[in-house]
């Protein structure tokens, strides 16, 4: 059974590709799923020789390897687009890169913004 | 080279009890979930139980509720069924498998044959 | 309870395209129940093919494919090859921590 998870409402929104897909750039945004399935936030960004590029972040449905998930970590050694999902409200404000193979722990801290909420 | 290694199986009574383990190398076991699959003789794979990366959370197929229990030491890198009240319908071989995002078992052990017979 | 279904056995020629399909008792399967599917051999581990309806795992030939064809989950095969000759599962996550396997389908390739 699922025990004390914490539960998803809202997430931080980010699209780097928000022209293209006709959508808002950044702001917060509301989770909605199937009742009786937890929700997630996510993050996912490049890596370009140290300089961080975000591609997304938002709202992700119920995904078993994402359950009981503080913090949003990535392990994948060197992918193309780095990912992470975590539980609880804006828990991918923050976002941290851990390699499997113990390498240096990098945590990347947003910009202070105003975001604005996404229905 | 990710690797899982099953362990414990045996023959046992029925109404005995038995600890498999599983234990991992290869990735970051603490920050992946994991689960138990069985294979009855002859039939298809069924999905037995599963326990997020703190083990805060677990679940279990219908028919093993209440007389398994799954359990995990990240300290260990090890995955644990405990399986009591075993019938001669949990015959089967057991794996354990690694699950990835997007909810799919990416790793898979050999499996270990779990036989209840007297 | 949830039940999933795939066709029991299937044959292909050499070289000829099978589709494998995988649906369920309540509904219409989508992306969110991440479907993936495996490949066994007897006496084998299973091997995993596709997840997420439609990615190829890593070191997959590109001759398996995923789909949704109309309210099921899908498996093709292009070009089928003797050593394509197994068992094929499907998987649905339904939430909540529950996957729940198809009954499988034994191919073979004559």
């Known amino acids: 059974s699922g025990r004390g998870e914490a539960e998803t409402r809202e997430c931080i929104y980010y699209n780097a590709n928000w022209e293209l897909e006709r959508t808002n750039q950044s702001g917060l945004e509301r989770c909605e799923g199937e009742q009786d399935k937890r929700l997630h936030c996510y993050a996912s960004w490049r890596n370009s020789s140290g300089t961080i590029e975000l591609v997304k972040k938002g709202c992700w449905l119920d995904d078993f390897n994402c359950y009981d998930r503080q913090e949003c970590v990535a392990t994948e050694e060197n992918p193309q687009v780095y990912f992470c999902c975590c539980e609880g409200n804006f828990c991918n404000e923050r976002f941290t890169h851990l390699p499997e193979a113990g390498g240096p722990e990098v945590t990347y801290e947003p910009p202070p913004t105003a975001p604005t909420l996404l229905t | 080279e990710v690797q899982l290694l099953e362990s414990g199986g045996g023959l046992v009574q029925p109404g005995g009890s038995l600890r498999l383990s599983c234990a991992a190398s290869?990735?970051?076991?603490?920050?992946?979930?994991m689960s138990w699959v069985r294979q009855a003789p002859g039939k298809g794979l069924e999905w037995v139980s599963s326990?997020?990366?703190?083990?805060?959370?677990?679940y279990y197929t219908d028919s093993v509720k209440g007389r398994f229990t799954v359990s995990r030491d990240n300290s260990r890198n090890t995955l644990y069924l405990q399986m009591n009240s075993l019938r001669a319908e949990d015959t089967a071989v057991y794996y354990c498998a690694k699950v990835y995002y997007y909810s799919f078992f990416d790793y898979w052990g050999q499996g270990t044959l779990v036989t209840v017979s007297s | 309870q949830t039940v999933v279904t795939q066709e029991p056995s299937f044959s292909v020629s050499p070289g000829g395209t099978v589709t494998l399909t995988c649906g369920f008792n309540s509904g219409s399967v989508s992306t969110s129940y991440y479907p993936s599917w495996y490949q066994q051999t007897p006496g084998q581990a299973p091997r995993t093919l596709i997840y997420?309806?439609?990615t190829r795992s890593s070191g997959v030939p590109d001759r398996f494919s995923g789909s949704i064809l109309g309210n099921k989950a899908a498996l093709t095969i292009t070009g089928a090859q003797a050593d394509d000759e197994s068992d094929y599962y499907c998987?649905?996550?339904?939430?909540?921590?529950?996957?729940?396997f198809g009954g499988g389908t034994k191919l073979t390739v004559l």
């Open positions: 998987v649905l996550y339904m939430g909540s921590g529950i996957h729940v």
């Open positions: 326990i997020s990366v703190t083990g805060g959370s677990t």
């Open positions: 290869g990735f970051t076991f603490r920050n992946s979930a």
């Open positions: 997420n309806t439609n």
